[in-house]
């Protein structure tokens, strides 16, 4: 049975193979019930959470998770050593940095310990499941009377990330947005000195080091405006 994993934003992410072992019987057995889908996300390549919907089970069940890396030196089956719980029932597993190998095929197996033949296996490309932390330390530089430059930092290898900048003024009804490559800077060439501006940024592990669909959270906004630009005409950074 082939299925497609959907990330929380609805984008197709990677295909996964499910291997269900069913009992050869005419009556419907517990082992024919599908196990919940496992969703894994690698947070800034610091840790990974693999979670499932524990409430989809017909009765509360402490499902167990095993994992390994396909065709690699790390192909030894590992037990989850740090379970996540929802109402005292296992609902996920957290793996630490040393257990994450981005560029090897990650195999995750969910199993019902009461029905060992009831199991499902998925294969995931972890480099497509990285979610970076939100950009930090937003700063604005006034390059000229009408030009602003926005800079920010990421707690990750900068060349691996692309960015999305949104900005608006106090007169606007909607954000204007601009994609930015790995250079993590953005210039606004024409600034109206009578308006206040707000900027925010988010980042994604794409396209140089992976093909993640999921963006980071938005940075804290930074504001710039006519009544503050006089304080320091060349640098102004104010977080909300």
């Amino acid at each position: 049975l082939n299925t497609t994993i959907l990330t929380p934003n609805g984008n197709e992410d990677t295909t996964a193979d499910f291997f269900l072992t069913t009992m050869p019987t005419d009556s419907l057995s517990v082992s024919t019930l599908p196990l919940p889908e496992v969703q894994c996300f690698v947070f800034n390549v610091e840790y990974m959470n693999c979670t499932w919907n524990s409430s989809s089970e017909p009765q509360p069940t402490n499902l167990t998770l095993h994992y390994w890396y396909k065709n690699s030196d790390n192909d030894k089956v590992q037990k989850c050593s740090h379970y996540l719980f929802s109402e005292e029932i296992t609902s996920g597993c957290q793996l630490q940095k040393k257990e994450i190998h981005l560029y090897q095929t990650f195999v995750v197996q969910l199993q019902d310990p009461r029905e060992p033949r009831r199991q499902a296996t998925q294969m995931l490309k972890l480099q497509n499941l990285v979610i970076p932390w939100a950009p930090e330390n937003l700063t604005l530089h006034k390059l000229s009377e009408s030009q602003l430059e926005l800079n920010w930092n990421n707690r990750f290898l900068n060349h691996c990330l692309e960015h999305l900048v949104q900005y608006r003024t106090d007169w606007d009804h909607s954000w204007t947005e601009q994609s930015v490559d790995y250079r993590h800077k953005f210039s606004l060439p024409s600034v109206d000195g009578q308006k206040r501006y707000t900027f925010r940024v988010r980042s994604r592990f794409n396209p140089l080091c992976g093909s993640a669909q999921h963006w980071s959270e938005w940075s804290h906004p930074i504001h710039w405006g006519s009544n503050t630009s006089k304080e320091n005409p060349f640098l102004f950074a104010l977080e909300a």
Epitope: L164, Q166, R168, T169, D170, W171, D172, H173, S174, W175, E177, K195, R196, T198, R202, W215, W218, P221, H223, G225, N227, A240
Partner: antibody, heavy 116, light 108 residues
Framework: EVQLVESGGGVVRPGGSLRLSCAAS????????MSWVRQAPGKGLEWISS????????DYADSVKGRFTISRDNAKNSLFLQMSSLRAEDTALYHC?????????WGQGTLVTVSS | DIQMTQSPSSLSASVGDRVTITCRAS??????LNWYQQKPGKAPKLLIY???SLQSGVPSRFSGSGSGTDFTLTISSLQPEDFATYYC??????????FGQGTRLEIK
């Protein structure tokens, strides 16, 4: 003439789901981010969610995060709000509005009642 | 989250009166403030944006002022159609967008 017409409201049991729609006309839909704002009976206005012009990013109030999903179809000039795990406190008139943080145009609203 | 507090919660006035409604933010919101009017059974209507800019089609008797934390909506000469509930709304730090609790303007 600008028009925003909401539909999809109704009576639903706690824990249930509803999908609200908003049909827009009279303005260039994809020039605007869009939002949902609700108003409980006899109460004030509460912002629920906003989505940007191309549908690529959305923001939610904490009270609905993880339960409601905003989306849009620019080809059909339509805005949607998928609501799940509904609670009694979600009972309100739901307005769609143009803009992400300044609401230039509003619909008359569609009433959602969550009751057992 | 930024809290918006309007005062008074309700007021009575007569046609021709000058009326002022105030809105206070729990922290500075620069000029990211909008004002709306809502009549019973109707959708809200944008009156003022960016604290002091009059929305197209809104009569000039409406005006807004203020910056930072304190804002006012003024109706210079009250007309019969102005009796309604008025809301302020901040968009400085979002999400969330927050509204004031409303000011109900009634006929004396």
């Amino acid at each position: 003439e600008v028009q925003l017409v909401e539909s999809g409201g109704g009576v639903v049991r706690p824990g249930g789901s509803l999908r609200l729609s908003c049909a827009a006309s009279g303005f260039t839909f994809d020039d605007y981010g869009m939002s949902w704002v609700r108003q409980a009976p006899g109460k004030g206005l509460e912002w629920i969610s906003s989505i940007n012009r191309n549908g690529g990013s959305a923001d939610y109030a904490d009270s609905v995060k993880g339960r409601f999903t905003i989306s849009r179809d620019n080809a059909k000039n339509s805005l949607f709000l998928q609501m799940s795990s509904l609670r009694a406190e979600d009972t309100a008139l739901y307005h769609c509005a143009s803009g992400e943080f300044r609401f230039d145009y509003w619909g008359q609203g569609t009433l959602v009642t969550v009751s057992s | 989250d930024i809290q918006m507090t309007q005062s008074p919660s309700s007021l009575s006035a007569s046609v021709g009166d000058r009326v002022t409604i105030t809105c206070r933010a729990s922290q500075s919101i620069s000029s990211y403030l909008n004002w709306y009017q809502q009549k019973p059974g109707k959708a809200p209507k944008l009156l003022i944006y960016a604290a002091s800019s009059l929305q197209s089609g809104v009569p000039s008797r409406f005006s807004g002022s203020g910056s930072g934390t304190d804002f006012t909506l003024t109706i210079s000469s009250l007309q019969p159609e102005d009796f309604a509930t008025y809301y302020c709304q901040q968009s400085y730090s979002t999400p969330p967008i927050t509204f004031g609790q409303g000011t109900r303007l009634e006929i004396k």
